[in-house]
């Protein structure tokens, strides 16, 4: 298969309000060169959740768990989840350029929020 895959293994994740949500994403290659970003929702109105290179994302931390040779971990954890955080989260690979262009997206992980 040509180039890389973006793998979001969890179709859905359910988290209690006030807890942290871990959103898993692995990528099979660094090539093409370019950043990974996380979004909630799709299309032009999507919301940027995390971009390592720039921006301030106080509730997001990176979670690198995979030591496998065949992929690299770009998972994140979002703390203090509220009902407003519900939605589908996408891990997106960009190709470096001026500007960077979207290359491939994961299938998405739907986050649902349970009452405490």
């Amino acid at each position: 298969e040509e180039e890389l895959q973006v793998i979001q293994p969890d179709k859905s994740v359910s988290v209690a309000a006030g807890e942290s949500a871990i959103l898993h994403c692995t990528v099979t290659s660094l090539i093409p060169v370019g950043p990974i970003q996380w979004f909630r929702g799709a299309g032009p109105a999507r919301e940027l959740i995390y971009n390592q290179k720039e921006g301030h994302f106080p509730r997001v931390t990176t979670v690198s768990e995979s030591t496998k040779r065949e992929n690299m971990d770009f998972s994140i954890s979002i703390s203090n989840i509220t009902p407003a955080d519900a939605g589908t989260y996408y891990c997106v690979k960009f190709r470096k350029g001026s500007p960077d262009t979207e290359f491939k997206s994961g299938a998405g992980t739907e986050l649902s929020v349970r009452a405490k």
């Epitope: 290659s29 093409p32 990974i36």
Partner: antibody
Framework: EVQLVESGGGLVKPGGSLRLSCAAS????????MSWVRQTPGKGLEWVAT????????YYPSSVKGRFTLSRDNAKNSLYLQMNSLRAEDTAVYYC???????????WGQGTTVTVSS | DIVLTQSPASLAVSLGERATISCRAS??????????MHWYQQKPGQPPKLLIY???NLESGVPDRFSGSGSRTDFTLTINPLQAEDVATYYC??????????FGGGTKVEIK
């Protein structure tokens, strides 16, 4: 067993051209990112070029960009480096290297020597 | 460019003792908590051989006396205990998403 065998090195005058080849076996070549890395006694190891598994994307450092062209033929399990406008500072041992993820250089060939001299 | 500075340039260690090599990057090589720093061993007349990938992962077939640690800008390769066959030059290499990818200048390990 993974094998990478480089060929095509030799003595060339400044301004001349050479084409290096790397024949791969023992792994699924079309799934791997491939690169060339060179080594000189003075400058140590230097990354020279990288190509994506399908051949769509290529990357070069500024020291060779515009002079070197990397290509691959997945049907022949082969990697090629076309080197033009060669300079004395291109003199080095050139290694072919494979990478499953485009991250580390997992396997290396034995190298082929390029000498640029008048 | 990200500059990798290895220290020391050469190291003499007694058999059975610990050898420690440092690699410092001019800027972080971490992406999402993963450090894109790798270590290679090169013996005279041979190509480099991958030992450690992504800072701390031991390549298949490499003896567990080799270990790697560190994050962001500071990394260490440790050989413990040092064996005679470990005499070689060791290189660090970064492959973050900022081109060009670069190598350290190498550390030559010898037996004291």
């Amino acid at each position: 067993e993974v094998q990478l065998v480089e060929s095509g090195g030799g003595l060339v005058k400044p301004g001349g051209s050479l084409r290096l080849s790397c024949a791969a076996s023992g792994f699924t070549f079309s799934s791997y990112v491939m690169s060339w890395v060179r080594q000189t006694p003075g400058k140590g190891l230097e990354w020279v070029a990288t190509i994506s598994s399908g051949g769509t994307y290529t990357y070069y450092p500024s020291s060779v960009k515009g002079r070197f062209t990397l290509s691959r033929d997945n049907a022949k399990n082969s990697l090629y480096l076309q080197m033009n406008s060669l300079r004395a500072e291109d003199t080095a041992v050139y290694y072919c290297a494979s990478s499953l993820t485009g991250s580390s250089f997992d396997y290396w060939g034995q190298g082929t020597t390029v000498t640029v001299s008048s | 460019d990200i500059v990798l500075t290895q220290s020391p340039a050469s190291l003499a260690v007694s058999l059975g003792e610990r050898a420690t090599i440092s690699c410092r990057a001019s800027e972080s090589v971490d992406l999402y908590g993963t450090s894109f720093m790798h270590w290679y061993q090169q013996k005279p007349g041979q190509p480099p051989k991958l030992l450690i990938y992504r800072a701390s992962n031991l390549e298949s077939g490499v003896p567990d006396r080799f270990s790697g640690s560190g994050s962001r800008t500071d990394f260490t390769l440790t050989i413990n205990p040092l064996q005679a066959e470990d005499v070689a030059t060791y290189y660090c290499h970064q492959s973050s998403d900022e081109l060009p990818w670069t190598f350290g200048g190498g550390t030559k390990v010898e037996i004291k």
